[in-house]
Every structure is written in C-alpha cells, then in structure tokens.
C-alpha cells in the first residue's frame, strides 16, 4: 500500500511539475520592469525566452516574438534548450510512468518491468526539474548581471547631460513558477526512484533448513540475496536451489514485501 | 461608440468641496481628469485603471484630489478637496487608448473657486 | 517629472502652407521595449475638448486626415500639417505619454496670417 502510495504520489507531484514548466517556459513574464522608484508605470516591459510584451496604462498590450535564431544572445538559447530538453523528458517520463503505475494492470506485465519503468521515470523525472532549475537560474543569474550594469549606467549620455533612463528589468512570475515546478519535478522524481525499491521483486530470505542428502549431511543456507538496484532478477546471484521446506511465515506473494502501511 | 459626459461643476468657495461626475459609455479600460484654467494650457490631473480601481495623481493633487469609479453606474468621479482659486478650470474627463493617448473626451464641466 | 517645452508658442501662416511645430522632452520618451517613442499630438479649437491627432510620436489616429504628420525621437519631436487647411487653424499640443504624471507642452497658437 505504502509503495502505491509513494508511486502515485510521486507521479501527481511530477505531473503537476511538468505542468509547471510547461507553463514557466511559455510564460511572458521572464523578466519584467523594475519599478524601483515608480510603482505606477504608464509603460510596464516584460519579456520571454518567445517574446517581449509592452503593456500600457490605456490597457493596450503589444507582444513582439523574436523572429531571430542567430541575433539572440547564447545565454537565451541555452535557457531554451535546457527548458525544452526538461519538457521532453519529463513527457516522456510522465508516460512511462503511466505504465509502471501499481495500480494500473496492462496484460501479464511482470512486477520487474514495472520497478524498471517507475525508476526510468523517476531518473527522467529527476534529470526534467533539474534542466527546469538550471535553466531558470541560468536566466536568473543574467538578470542580476544586466541589473547591476544598467544600474551602474542608470543615465547615459554626453557628460551625463543627456538623460536617457535605461530600463532596468528584475525577476518575473515565470521565474518562481520554473524554481518551484522543477523543484517539484525533482520530488517527484525522488519518490518515484523511492517506490521502485519497494516494487522490485526481492528474493525472500529463508531460514537456515538442514537437509540429509546420502553420503553425508550438508546444509544447504540459500541466502538471502536483496535486489539493491530495482532491475528485474540478477540470474548471477539467483538461488540454485530451492528448498521445500519452509516455514509459515516465509510463504509470501510477490512484491508485497513492504506493501504495508 | 465611447460617450463621456461631465457634471458637478459650479462655483465653490476656497476650501470648498466638490465631486465631479463623468457618465461613461462604451468601453474604457483606464480613464483620466484632465483640466485647463482658463486661457491657459491643458493639465494632467489623474489617472484610474476603471477595472482595478488602481489610481495615480499629479504631484500638486495628491491629498486634495480622490479619482475613483463605480462600477455599477458606469461612472467616473473626481473628488476635490481644500479648493483654491487656482483650481479655477474647465475639468474634462478622457479615455486613454494605445499609445497612451487620449481618445475620447467629455464636453468639460467648468469649476469656479471664488469668495 | 518630464518637462515638455513647445515652439513656437504661436505661428502666423496661410492656408496652403507646410507649418511645422517642435516638442522637446527633458527624458527619451522612447521605449526601449518596442522601440517606441510615446508622444502624443492633440488638436484643440476655441470651446472644444482637445482631439487626439497622432500617438507613439508617428501613428496618425483613425479618421484625421493625412496632411498631419508626426516624426521624432528620443527628446525632439516634430508635428508637420502639410498643407495648412482652415479648419486647421486651433491650438496644438504635445503630451507626454511615457511615464507618470502625463504632461502636456505649454501648446501652439496656429493663426491666420
């Protein structure tokens, strides 16, 4: 019970993570205005790694996409690249998941594939809110960069004669919308890699039982080999043999090992 | 079609109250009061977003002047406290559209402040 | 604040002539944003409300007629009426749209000649 649980859990959390990025990566708010000193503003700015948005006090918005590949600076290619790539495998992620949910039953589906399949997602999921965090503070971190150097620049000009006020952007709404969806992917991820321990099918350890072969006595301690990596049967370190005897308490349904609450 | 009508004005003694209407029909996302003395130029009083109720005002009326909207009688106000005679003007009211301009304005109200 | 000083304060000129106003902003009224310059034109006649000519220092508004033209940028700004028609005659000024609080040029009185 508690695996499904965990399993499920980490599944909803990952799926409301991806969601998140999702959103986070289409977002406009990247970068907004800094209303430093005017927190009316007749003009307010903002940006996105698609677009930038020019937002009026009449309520006129005006959105302009970067109709550029080449002229975009690299730092806004690799936030892209590293949101998209957390997109996919968190897509991916969320579908091989699906299948190695316990609760869903597809054909004779060995409880095996399905500790594979959940800790295949769990990875997928864990490397899809990592992409999501680096590539929010990759972006972050160009902010702060730009932020003190306009700042440093706040009035350009001839001798300073001139004033033209350079606009000073700070962190959007997308930003805190990445940091938490890819934190949450990255639970996720953590709880499913969790689940997938107690999926895996573990050889039962049995109790010592002595038995009388002719010729001479020898005992025969099968023992108790745990799966530590979740994969399926390891046939190298799989019993040879399997004694009959067993006692009540070692007669045990595969994997509800720790299928309790 | 966007219609703007003003009323409420009238003459006032210094110190006085007044509140200033503006019936607005028609679309409007942001409004604004904008007055003029008399031979003398056009002057920007406030601004309102009508939707948030979000206001902002010119340095000189902060304190004494309160733009706000009612919602359900599609009406503009310009509350004016503490008048002076220099508050003597023709108060138009006038919607905001792209680029910040505005479009749409009402035939003015005429606010006298005199003893 | 922006300050925004006009000139000339009046001009005296025929029908048919080429009249050109200036507006001169103490800040950029330019966008960094969408590369837009946000200063606004108005048309005001003796009585009447003022009437919005041209916005984002360029952009003639629907219905006025295309002998009004707009140009600028940064803090110098130009309101150019091609060929002056009587109905032309009235005052004008420039606003700016850019930052709060708005402010409006002292205005241009166009005259008969």
């Known amino acids: 019970m508690a695996v499904t649980a965990c399993q499920g859990l980490g599944f909803v959390v990952s799926l409301i993570g991806i969601a998140g990025i999702i959103a986070a990566t289409c977002m406009d708010q990247w970068s907004t205005q800094d209303l430093y000193n005017n927190p009316v503003t007749a003009v307010f700015n903002y940006q996105g790694l698609w677009r930038s948005c020019v937002r009026e006090s009449s309520g006129f918005t005006e959105c302009r996409g970067y109709f550029t590949l080449l002229g975009l600076p690299a730092m806004l290619q690799a936030v892209r690249a590293l949101m998209i790539v957390g997109i996919v495998l968190g897509a991916i992620g969320l579908l091989v998941s699906i299948f190695a949910l316990k609760c869903i039953r597809i054909g004779s589906m060995e409880d095996s594939a399905k500790a594979n399949m959940t800790l295949t997602s769990g990875i997928m999921f864990i490397v899809s809110g990592l992409c999501a965090i680096a590539g929010v503070s990759v972006f972050a971190n160009m902010l702060v960069t730009n932020f003190w150097m306009s700042t440093a620049n706040m009035y350009t000009g001839m001798g300073g004669m001139v004033q033209t006020v350079q606009t000073r952007y700070t962190f959007g709404a997308a930003l805190f919308v990445g940091w938490v969806a890819g934190g949450l992917t990255l639970i996720g991820g953590v709880m499913m890699c969790i689940a997938c321990r107690g999926l895996a099918p573990e050889e039962t350890n049995y109790k010592a039982v002595s038995y009388h072969a002719s010729g001479h006595s020898v005992a025969y301690k099968p023992g108790g080999f745990k799966a530590s990596t979740g994969f399926g049967s390891n046939t190298k370190n799989k019993k040879i043999y399997d004694g009959g005897a067993r006692t009540e308490d070692e007669v045990q349904s595969y994997p509800s090992k720790h299928d309790y609450v | 079609e966007v219609q703007l009508v003003e009323s409420g004005g009238g003459l006032v003694q210094p110190g006085g109250s007044l509140r200033l209407s503006c019936a607005v029909s028609?679309?409007?996302?942001?409004m604004n009061w904008v007055r003029q003395a008399p031979g003398k130029g056009l002057e920007w009083v406030a601004w309102i977003n009508m939707y948030t109720g979000e206001p902002t005002y010119a340095d000189d009326f902060k304190g004494r002047f309160t733009i706000s909207r009612d919602d359900s009688k599609n009406t503009l106000y310009l509350q004016m406290n503490s008048l002076r005679a220099e508050d003597t003007a023709v108060y138009y009211c006038?919607?905001?559209?792209?680029?910040?301009?505005?479009?749409?304005w009402g035939q003015g109200t005429l606010v006298t402040v005199s003893s | 604040d922006i300050q925004m000083t006009q000139s000339p304060s009046s001009l005296s000129a025929s029908v048919g002539d080429r009249v050109t106003i200036t507006c001169k902003s103490s800040q950029s009224l330019l966008n960094s944003g969408n590369q837009k310059s946000y200063l606004t034109w108005y048309q005001q006649k003796p009585g009447k409300a003022p009437k919005l000519l041209i916005y984002?220092?360029?952009t003639l508004e629907s219905g006025v007629p295309s002998r009004f033209s707009g140009s600028g940028s940064g803090t110098d700004y130009t309101l150019t009426i091609s060929s002056l028609q009587p109905e032309d005659f009235a005052t004008y000024y420039c606003?700016?749209?850019?930052?709060?609080?708005?402010?409006f040029g002292q205005g241009t009185k166009v005259e008969i000649k």
């Open positions: 984002w220092a360029s």
């Open positions: 028609g679309y409007t996302f942001s």
């Open positions: 006038a919607r905001l559209t792209k680029g910040n301009g505005m479009d749409y």
């Open positions: 606003q700016n749209a850019y930052s709060f609080p708005f402010t």
